[in-house]
């Protein structure tokens, strides 16, 4: 065995640049650090066969399978994949190890399978086997967490039925409003499924796995807070668990809390109470209303009453199917080049949506914020003043929603010119869409003031680049203007821009650009 080379097999994951396609041994990608694949002699195999750990790759991911050989002298090699031989060019690294690489760009089903590397060294021949498969993320799920009461204990269990098994954490905050943002110092995270400390101001449970992160907030009515101007509303789908927490603080223990649904006390077994003294010796009571699996008749106004506080209510609405309510009519905006502006969509949805903003085939992360009136809002400000079409897309388990926006940036036209044997054309993007004039420059008109009206053809908007309109104007060549300089000018309310063209022979001859404001 000591005569055998020491083999190291590694996997290098690449972060794709969009330009990468095909197999290559140059690296047009940012690489993550190599991962050891534990290459080992395959037990009970005839001949010297090394095997690497099974490799799972996401669809469209790019990887390199690499073998490092610690063997004296030169090596020659051959890759075989699905009975086809592939070229193999070993090189040597700084430690004088032979290095052989196979780059798989943009992984597809056809590139999955067994990759065999045959190596011949001065001492021996051996084979290295890589098995590459596509990670089956179709089986992956990430479900929103829900709560259950822990048997015989005053504690909540957070459950998320997801694959792969998610990491569950409680996100707790004892401040009000903005200071309860995820990364705020007021936020405490506990990576466990069971929570005993249920007196906090804001309690959320989050589950995360390869597909992302989903959170559920414990719906709370705080009798010490001024009620919202609109009644808080909680949506649930039939079969989901209902949890509402009512919280109240009083100077002493001499108060009680009760839950009513449509003026009828909740049945025993649908609520439980906890109390504690806070640091300033005031008494905190919480009363949970819960239904393990809601039906349509659980819809209604849930009211929490206290003998020492004004009562408050929440409207619980049970729906058969999730929804996204918002106006989907397209919206057009016209802004100045440096004007601050954000697109925004106001919607009501259940379950919570996943959303994206898209511009020019690029997707941008989408943030949503809950408003006091039960609506949510998503804003997009990262348009960098690029005109065009912006798309907001939202979906949840049961519904989809798309809204289009057009952004126009008010600016002076900029002109590009080109000429052929028979015509001259000018293009401009400015907004509002420009109008055109053509002028002839001659001895009689050295300042190019002689207007050309014959043979001019304007196209208001001949090209739409991701929603950005381009206006063009074409001048057909006539004997009267051949050999002369002509000037095309585009103008709108913000200014004028011109380009001068020499009309003599084919080829683009933009000559001088005048910028006239």
């Amino acid at each position: 065995n000591q005569d055998l080379p020491v083999i190291k097999c590694v996997l290098i994951n690449h972060k794709n640049n969009d330009s990468s396609v095909g197999k290559s041994s140059s690296y047009p990608m940012v690489s993550e650090s190599p991962e050891d694949l534990g290459c080992a002699l395959r037990p009970q195999s005839s001949g010297t066969v090394y095997e690497a750990a099974a490799v799972e790759v996401d669809v469209s991911a790019s990887i390199t399978l690499q073998v490092l050989v610690d063997a004296p002298g030169n090596i020659s090699c051959l890759w075989v994949f699905k009975h086809s031989s592939l070229n193999c060019q070993p090189h040597f690294d700084l430690q004088n190890r032979g290095v052989v690489s196979m780059v798989i760009l943009k992984m597809t089903e056809t590139q999955a399978g067994e990759y065999l590397l045959f190596i011949q060294s001065e001492a021996t021949n051996y084979t290295i086997l890589f098995t590459v498969s596509i990670r089956n993320t179709l089986l992956y799920t990430l479900r929103r967490p829900y709560f259950r009461k822990m048997e015989n204990q005053d504690a909540l269990v957070c459950i998320s039925e997801s694959v792969p098994e998610p990491i569950v954490e409680w996100v707790l905050c004892d401040s009000q409003g903005e200071s309860c943002k995820e990364e705020s110092p007021a936020v405490v995270k506990k990576e466990e499924k069971v929570l005993h400390e249920l007196f906090g101001t804001d309690i959320r449970c989050c589950a995360r796995n390869e597909l992302g992160r989903e959170c559920t907030r414990l719906f709370t009515i705080d009798l010490n807070q001024t009620p919202q101007t609109t009644l808080p509303q909680l949506f649930l789908k039939v079969g989901e668990p209902l949890w509402i927490r009512c919280k109240a603080v009083h100077v002493n223990h001499g108060f009680g809390l009760t839950w009513e649904l449509e003026n009828k006390a909740l049945e025993e077994g649908n609520y439980f109470e906890m109390s504690t003294y806070s640091t300033n010796r005031t008494m905190i009571r919480i009363l949970f209303a819960f239904v393990s699996s809601v039906a349509r008749n659980d819809t209604g106004y849930y009211t929490c009453s206290s003998s020492k506080h004004p009562s408050q209510s929440a409207l619980v609405t049970i729906v058969e199917k999730g929804f996204i309510n918002a106006t989907n009519s397209s919206e057009d905006y016209e802004i100045d080049q440096y004007e601050e502006f954000c697109f925004s969509v106001r919607f009501k949805a259940y379950p919570q949506i996943r959303c994206t903003w898209t511009f020019s085939r690029k997707s941008f992360p989408c943030e949503q914020k809950g408003l006091d009136n039960g609506y949510s809002i998503s804003k997009f400000c990262n348009h960098k003043h690029q005109p065009g079409e912006y798309i907001f897309h939202a979906e949840n388990d049961d519904a989809q929603f798309t809204k289009m926006f057009t952004l126009n940036i008010r600016r002076k036209p900029q002109v590009l010119a080109e000429a052929s044997a028979s015509q001259a054309s000018c293009f401009s993007d400015g907004y509002p869409l420009p109008s055109w004039t053509w002028k002839k420059c001659s001895d009689k008109s050295p300042n190019c003031t002689e207007e050309i009206t014959e043979g001019v053809w304007n196209r208001k908007a001949n090209r739409k680049v991701f929603g950005q309109w381009v206006s063009s104007s074409t001048l057909n060549m006539s004997e009267a203007i051949k050999g002369f300089l002509v000037k095309c000018c585009a103008y709108n309310s913000l200014g004028t821009s011109c380009e001068t063209i020499l009309l003599n022979s084919p080829g683009p001859f933009p000559f001088i650009q005048d910028n006239i404001s």
Epitope: E35, A40, P43, A53, L129, P164
Partner: antibody, heavy 124, light 107 residues
Framework: QVTLKESGPTLVKPTETLTLTCTLS??????????VSWIRQPPGKCLEWLAH???????SYSTSLKNRLTISKDSSKTQVVLTMTNVDPVDTATYYC????????????????WGQGTLVTVSS | DIQMTQSPSSLSASVGDRVTITCRAS??????LGWYQQKPGKAPKRLIY???TLQSGVPSRFSGSGSGTEFTLTISSLQPEDFATYYC?????????FGCGTKVEIK
């Protein structure tokens, strides 16, 4: 360079919960059949396998300790955490984590790399 | 659970000796067995996997044999660095179980 490094408290009181972390480098649990096991060895005694976790979240536990153990991995797949509840002085041991490799043709290589171990003493 | 019985529990030998350590499984485990060497204060190191395949970088004086319930680790010519404790591990079924070790001491 493959390394596994155990970390956690050196002293724990009886009935408390022990949390140990194994930090991986040179490989991760992102790959199809990579796994990590926890193994312990009381001073001067035999090795005892405790639990393992694979990249696909498949888990197994020692029969005698399964009610007290939880094994998990972090989202970056470079840390494996073992928690042991209700510890007792008999849980005093050096705790090791070690790598498992699942090969393409279906066989598994157990414990080709080990961490250096961390000694945990359970005492009041 | 599968019990792994290792024998002897300790042995004394001299440099150059041939040393044999045995591991017996309480039920058949095919060839799902590994051998590990541990030196005081150090983590174990894998020598043999799949009952008889030598770990890369391990000297060829170490060899493993056996299948089913009887397994053997042989050191053909004991070297000074081989004085250590040797463990077998079955990974045929859960829970995984180790033998309780054979301590190889200098005679």
């Amino acid at each position: 360079q493959v390394t596994l490094k155990e970390s956690g408290p050196t002293l724990v009181k009886p009935t408390e919960t022990l949390t140990l972390t194994c930090t991986l480098s040179g490989f991760s649990l992102n790959n199809a059949r990579m796994g990590v096991s926890w193994i312990r060895q009381p001073p001067g005694k035999c090795l005892e396998w405790l639990a393992h976790i694979f990249s696909n979240d498949e888990k197994s536990y020692s029969t005698s300790l399964k009610n007290r153990l939880t094994i998990s991995k972090d989202s970056s797949k470079t840390q494996v955490v073992l928690t042991m509840t209700n510890v007792d002085p008999v849980d005093t041991a050096t705790y090791y984590c070690a790598r498992i490799v699942g090969y393409g043709s279906g066989w598994y290589g157990f414990f080709d790399y080990w961490g250096q171990g961390t000694l945990v003493t359970v005492s009041s | 659970d599968i019990q792994m019985t290792q024998s002897p529990s300790s042995l004394s030998a001299s440099v150059g000796d041939r040393v044999t350590i045995t591991c017996r499984a309480s039920q058949g485990i095919r060839n799902d067995l590994g051998w590990y060497q541990q030196k005081p204060g150090k983590a174990p190191k894998r020598l043999i996997y799949a009952a008889s395949t030598l770990q890369s970088g391990v000297p060829s004086r170490f060899s493993g044999s056996g299948s089913g319930t009887e397994f053997t680790l042989t050191i053909s010519s004991l070297q000074p660095e081989d004085f250590a404790t040797y463990y077998c591990l079955q990974h045929n079924s859960y829970p995984l179980t180790f033998g309780c070790g054979t301590k190889v001491e200098i005679k």
